[in-house]
């Protein structure tokens, strides 16, 4: 039987009446164009909705936008367009919402041609009031808030000027010209690249990387011959052109660009690219594109310095620079990532790692699922997950995989069961153990969202026809109830719930169409009365993450420690609540060789856990140099995996080797670095 249709399902009593009393409709008095929605702050209930309507005329575009505000999670909206003087807001810039609970909002307006600069509307009280400010430049990008101080903004102008404001957009100062890319670092530091000979495109590979730590009073050139740069965790990466040819290499700094080391990664040619897939303060996942137009590359994982890299996954699907990759961090369980590989026969298969890229495997076939037509053996196959690539290929996949840090272990995704991703209509699958095992949750494609830290899952069928039914589950997707939220079906455009999955409100967005007009409409449903009581101790049970064999003393050990969690029982219908904090208990594991990666100059032969010294490295593709600093180049061949907390057990000690004489290249020697002031 289909999920939720057998006698196993515990029904939620009187749910229709409870939900009907908590369903709020709002019809927007606009013509249907585009709509964008932003949450302002956390747990504030404030939502801003911007509707825009474009009419392309012969010479220009006529546009109208309206701004609405809700302060009750979308149950009621108020038209506040007058607060922005009925100005047309540029949708491509969206609404720039300040970090954390700053309550700051910046809207960028469309201004008529010939004006000296752009115009913004600023609010610092959660969009209750706005101040109009005319800019001394035309913005090219959305305003970027400093993560440390929401009063500090930066923006690039259409003339490639780098502009900074220290008083939340009231006054602006151009701190540098000829800027290609600018990013906030930590401690209000700004990193940016500049060109010398005319344009960013013309100077690609000859850019300079600059840093200012005082909002433009002084500058330091921290890199030359730069192709691009990126920030990930505590690492600053620069892609640098080689002296002798058109290849480039990654260099990494962990001190904001004062010193650099060459990453032990292959160099790439003009048509190739590097991409930081994920980064934290411990390590980095780096994708290195394969030569030629293959659509795939290799994932490498770094050591704690971002210098030494281990090959993690071959034939990793990544179409082009800025193109599509299915790489997904499963945020509901530590160490878990999912992605796709392009196999030799050009089929796409899903792979999962539970140990931060150490090993990759196929996803286990869901119980009670049949292998589809892609499977050679009808009894042996895997689950394959649809993510960004499938969406880009216009397959019938309305949503990417979903996981939330506070809904421990839960992963929801579209997928197919076979030897590879299928172009057939997918179903929705759920895992409650971070991707180790899966169950079919819903037949056919759906939109889905997690509420109340996993206490409720909500879904809406993906259909070209108007809809009026929402499905919900209080037991992690085992059983489903359906609720008709309106008599008059709407053309559905999206589900919206407050980021963080702590809310119990869901908004269903769509439009109604009549003979002459179509209007935006939203239905906000509050599930608070479905989960009538607060959860108590008896509603939770203890779960060991990553458990595979209880008879193994180290069962559950991942990166040197195991974690037990208190998890809501599937049968408990109660509120985790907005203040819910995941209760977990770590315990340290004994070290094994699996807890170490091979340091520079060493490698692991296939099916061996020991690190063996590489043959002579001179001229080797993976050569690197740390200014020949001796202390960096002494190694016993092993290095603890970043984030690994193991203690005791195996301690790989061997003769310490000095690899300084094997160092054969350099970058940005200190004399090349110079300081400049405004």
């Amino acid at each position: 039987s289909a999920p939720g249709e057998d006698e196993e399902c515990g029904r939620v009593r009187d749910f229709v009446a409870k939900l009907a009393n908590n369903t709020h409709q709002h019809v927007f008095d606009d013509l249907r164009g585009s709509v964008s929605l932003s949450w302002v702050g956390d747990s504030t209930g404030v939502i801003l909705v911007l509707t825009t309507f474009h009419v392309p005329l012969v010479i220009m575009t006529f546009g109208q936008s309206k701004l609405y505000r809700s302060e009750d999670y979308g149950k009621n909206f108020k038209d506040i367009t007058d607060l922005i003087n009925n100005t047309f807001i540029r949708t491509e810039f969206g609404m720039a919402i300040g970090p954390e609970n700053s309550g700051k909002v910046v809207l960028t307006a469309e201004v008529s041609g010939g004006s000296r600069g752009g115009r913004i509307f600023r609010s610092s009280d959660f969009a209750k009031n706005f101040v109009q400010t005319d800019l001394p430049f035309h913005p090219l990008t959305q305003m970027m808030y400093s993560p440390q101080n929401s009063d500090y903004l930066l923006a690039l102008s259409t003339e490639n000027g780098l502009w900074v404001s220290k008083n939340f957009g009231g006054k602006w100062e151009e701190i540098h010209k000829a800027v290609c890319l600018a990013k906030w670092g930590s401690d209000n530091t700004i990193f940016f690249t500049t060109y010398a000979n005319g344009s960013c495109k013309a100077d690609l590979g000859a850019l300079e990387l600059w840093r200012t730590s005082d909002l433009g009073k002084s500058f330091k050139t921290i890199g030359v011959k730069i192709y691009s740069f990126g920030l990930g965790g505590r690492f600053l990466f620069a892609s640098v052109m080689a002296d002798k040819d058109t290849t480039r290499r990654i260099h990494v700094s962990t001190d904001q660009g004062d010193t650099w080391s060459m990453a032990q990664l292959p160099s790439v040619g003009q048509e190739q690219f590097y991409s930081i897939l994920a980064a934290n303060d411990d390590m980095v996942f780096m994708h290195v594109d394969e030569p030629g137009d293959t659509g795939f590359g290799t994932i490498f994982t770094s050591d704690d310095r971002g210098i030494v890299y281990s090959k993690s996954l071959d034939r990793h699907l990544y179409t082009t620079t800025g193109g599509e990759t299915d790489f997904t961090n499963v945020t509901s369980l530590r160490g878990v990532y999912i992605t796709s590989v392009l196999s030799e026969d050009n089929s796409i298969q899903t792979m999962i790692t539970f140990d931060q890229g150490g090993r990759w495997t196929h996803l286990r076939k869901p119980e009670n699922s049949e292998c589809d037509a892609t499977a050679k053996n009808k009894n042996e196959c895997s689950l394959h997950i649809h993510a960004s690539y499938s969406i880009s290929q216009k397959l019938n996949v309305p949503m990417a995989p979903l996981s939330e840090p506070n809904a421990v272990g839960i992963v929801i995704a579209h997928g197919s069961v076979g030897d590879a991703i299928s172009v057939m209509v997918p179903d929705v699958y759920i895992s409650d153990d971070g991707g180790a095992s899966w169950t079919k949750m819903l037949e056919g494609p759906h939109y889905y969202t997690i509420l109340d830290s996993g206490g409720i899952i909500v879904a809406i069928e993906h259909s070209s026809r108007p809809i009026n039914v929402i499905k919900f589950s209080t037991d992690e997707g085992q059983c489903w109830q359906t609720y008709t939220f309106t008599r008059d079906p709407i053309y559905f455009t999206g589900l919206a719930s407050e980021p963080g999955a702590r809310s119990m409100n869901i908004s269903i967005w769509g439009f109604t169409e009549s003979f002459l007009t179509s209007q935006w409409v939203s239905y906000t449903i509050d599930f608070k009365d479905i989960l009538e009581r607060n959860c108590e101790e008896k509603d939770y049970t203890i779960w060991l993450a990553h458990s595979t064999d209880p008879e193994d003393y180290e069962d559950g050990c991942i990166l040197g420690y195991k974690e037990q969690f208190l998890r809501l029982r599937k049968s408990s219908v109660c509120q985790n609540g907005r203040d819910y904090v995941v209760t977990k208990q770590p315990s340290i594991c004994l070290c094994s060789l699996e807890d170490f990666l091979c340091d520079f100059g060493y490698y692991r032969p296939e099916n061996d856990s020991k690190c063996v010294e590489q043959p002579e490295l001179k001229g080797h593709d993976l050569e690197f140099c740390l200014y020949g600093r001796e202390e960096h180049l002494t190694t016993n061949g092993y290095r603890k995996i970043p984030g690994d907390k193991c203690q005791g057990g195996v301690n790989p000690v061997r003769e310490v080797k000095d690899l300084k004489k094997k160092c054969t290249s350099n970058f940005l020697s200190p004399e090349k670095q110079n300081s400049k002031s405004n």
């Epitope: 203890i542 458990s547 049968s571 315990s587």
Partner: antibody, heavy 124, light 106 residues
Framework: QVQLVQSGAEVKKPGSSVKVSCKAS????????ISWVRQAPGQGLEWMGG????????NYAQKFQGRVTITADESTSTAYMELSSLRSEDTAVYYC?????????????????WGQGTTVTVSS | DIQMTQSPSTLSASVGDRVTITCRAS??????LAWYQQKPGKAPKLLIY???SLESGVPSRFSGSGSGTEFTLTISSLQPDDFATYYC????????FGGGTKVEIK
């Protein structure tokens, strides 16, 4: 083969406490929950509570909350159950049992290994 | 807490009989139910876990079924060694046992 060996029979006065031990051998004690179940003469089985040796995470049946304390010592692979404020109706055979485990959930798969039982008699 | 109601409380049967014991939960417990056999003066022995999975070493004449709130233990052909008391136990909440069913010789 996993075995659970419990301490010997006890005779206690009302109002006093009793502490029963349960020593595991031949398996990975730390990775399984240990439950305590009692059976009064001629009666059925009654779950009192359980503990997971890793981290010492204990939980108790509502009926015994505040009166029972379950602990575990990983180094000796031993679990303990202490029941205080004893009354005559606490006279029973007390069993420790290992919770079988097939996944990360500790308490869902039944109790697959049992101790031999410890008779506790409460009498003035 | 979840209540478990077992029936019948006593059952008289002969060797070779097919015996069925039922257990009802006061609320849905999915498939989280175990069955035990206990003989006088001995500790209980696990027969079935997760409603229908047979514990290793248990004869295949024992089988379990059901989900949600209604569960059944079946002994397809009663053997002399099977005369004992049987308990169901739910695990989807603080653990609770049924009252027991004594299977005696007719």
């Amino acid at each position: 083969q996993v075995q659970l060996v419990q301490s010997g029979a006890e005779v206690k006065k009302p109002g006093s406490s009793v502490k029963v031990s349960c020593k595991a051998s031949g398996g990975t004690f730390r990775n399984y929950a240990i439950s305590w179940v009692r059976q009064a003469p001629g009666q059925g089985l009654e779950w009192m509570g359980g503990i997971i040796p890793i981290g010492g995470w204990a939980n108790y049946a509502q009926k015994f909350q505040g009166r029972v304390t379950i602990t575990a010592d990983e180094s000796t692979s031993t679990a303990y159950m202490e029941l205080s404020s004893l009354r005559s109706e606490d006279t029973a055979v007390y069993y420790c049992a290992r919770q079988g485990r097939k996944t990360g959930y500790y308490y869902y798969y039944g109790m697959d290994v049992w101790g031999q039982g410890t008779t506790v008699t409460v009498s003035s | 807490d979840i209540q478990m109601t077992q029936s019948p409380s006593t059952l008289s049967a002969s060797v070779g009989d097919r015996v069925t014991i039922t257990c009802r939960a006061s609320q849905s417990i999915s498939s989280w139910l175990a069955w035990y056999q206990q003989k006088p003066g001995k500790a209980p022995k696990l027969l079935i876990y997760k409603a229908s999975s047979l514990e290793s070493g248990v004869p295949s004449r024992f089988s379990g079924s059901g989900s949600g709130t209604e569960f059944t233990l079946t002994i397809s052909s009663l053997q002399p060694d099977d005369f004992a008391t049987y308990y169901c136990q739910q695990a989807d909440g603080h653990i609770t046992f049924g009252g027991g069913t004594k299977v005696e010789i007719k």
